[in-house]
Structure formats: structure tokens, C-alpha cells
Amino acid sequence: QPDAINAPVTCCYNFTNRKISVQRLASYRRITSSKCPKEAVIFKTIVAKEICADPKQKWVQDSMDHLDKQTQTPKT
């Protein structure tokens, strides 16, 4: 098993300054590591480009909501 302590950490140092259409977004992941200077969201676009965004911005929160709801299944 690889040593998780030595696993590389992805950080965002700058955020996009333009709003991205949700139609262009495929997924997101949160950067929550204390080793990173900023709390961040990394969006992956439908063409597999990764973009750092500020989770404090409303459009970023709305985009995460939109992507979350796309994962909803009527199992529960």
C-alpha cells in the first residue's frame, strides 16, 4: 500500500476571474488540505480542463449544487 503521508497534494494558488457556464462543467472536487494556502474548488470541464475557483463565490456554490443534483439517484 502506498504511504498516504507522502501522497502529493494539489493546491490552487489563483482562482478564475470569470464565471463558467454549468453546461461546460463535468465535475468538481474540493481542496480541503491544510497544506494548501487557500480553500478551493477544482472544476473539471467537459473537455477535461481543470479550473481553480473560489468556493466563497455564489456562482461556484450554485455550480456545485447543480453538479451534486446530477448525481442524484432515486435509490433512497
Epitope: S27, Y28, R29, R30, T32, E39, V41, P55, K56, V60, Q61, D62, M64, D65, L67, D68, K69, T71, Q72, T73, K75, T76
Partner: nanobody, 123 residues
């Protein structure tokens, strides 16, 4: 890091009501999807309800739909679970969770968890 503290649990008779609260501190509360889960003795942790960051959408497990209501107040960094028409089978420890990763009702997509509050419904 997000810290979550639940309150409002207790002992109630069947048919009664309780309102659970979960106060968050730390990082930006409005940037997290919030959920409630529960765990009864000898059972696995079970999804109860989820609310989006904006509060505009909610989703419930079939077992609580129509009886429980999840809501949030981003100005107060708090999420609530109003529980009405309680049944003995609702007895469990109720956990509040903050969802950082993409998902909906899956526990694995929630990064931060409270310590839980006990709800006991007597018949």
C-alpha cells in the same frame, strides 16, 4: 476544517416532534452541501436528508419523507432537521455532515461530521 455540533436530541413519545440543530464553525458554511444521517444500534449509518448550499433543493429518504424537514440558515451557519410524527423506529444517533465532495446522499462524499445527538422515541 469545519466543526459541527448537533443539539436538540432527547426522549420523546411516539407522534411527538423534535427539532435538531447543527452549528458549524470554521470554513465558509455556505460552500458546503449539508446532510443529516442516523445510526440505530446494531445498524449501519443511514442517510436521512440533504440540502443544497443555496437551500433551494432538498432530498429525503423514503423512511422520513413527509415527516422530516431539513432547512438551513447560512447567516447563522446552522442547519436544522424538524422531525414530526416520530416513530419508535426513528430512534438513533443523528449526525450532521458537511459535504465537500461531489455527490448527494452518499456518506463518502461528506468530509466533516458532528459527534451526533441521541433521539429516542418511546411507544
Amino acid at each position: 476544517e469545519v466543526q459541527l455540533v448537533e443539539s436538540g436530541g432527547g426522549l420523546v413519545q411516539a407522534g411527538g416532534s423534535l427539532r435538531l440543530s447543527c452549528a458549524a464553525s470554521g470554513r465558509t458554511f455556505s460552500s458546503y452541501r449539508m446532510g443529516w444521517f442516523r445510526q440505530a444500534p446494531e445498524k449501519e449509518r443511514e442517510f436521512v436528508a440533504v440540502i443544497t448550499r443555496s437551500g433551494g433543493s432538498t432530498f429525503y429518504s423514503n423512511s422520513v419523507k413527509g415527516r422530516f424537514t431539513i432547512s438551513r440558515d447560512n447567516a447563522k451557519n446552522t442547519v436544522y432537521l424538524q422531525m414530526n410524527s416520530l416513530k419508535p423506529e426513528d430512534t438513533a444517533v443523528y449526525y450532521c455532515a458537511a459535504g465537500a465532495q461531489m455527490g448527494w446522499a452518499e456518506a463518502s462524499t461528506y468530509d466533516y461530521w458532528g459527534q451526533g445527538t441521541q433521539v429516542t422515541v418511546s411507544s
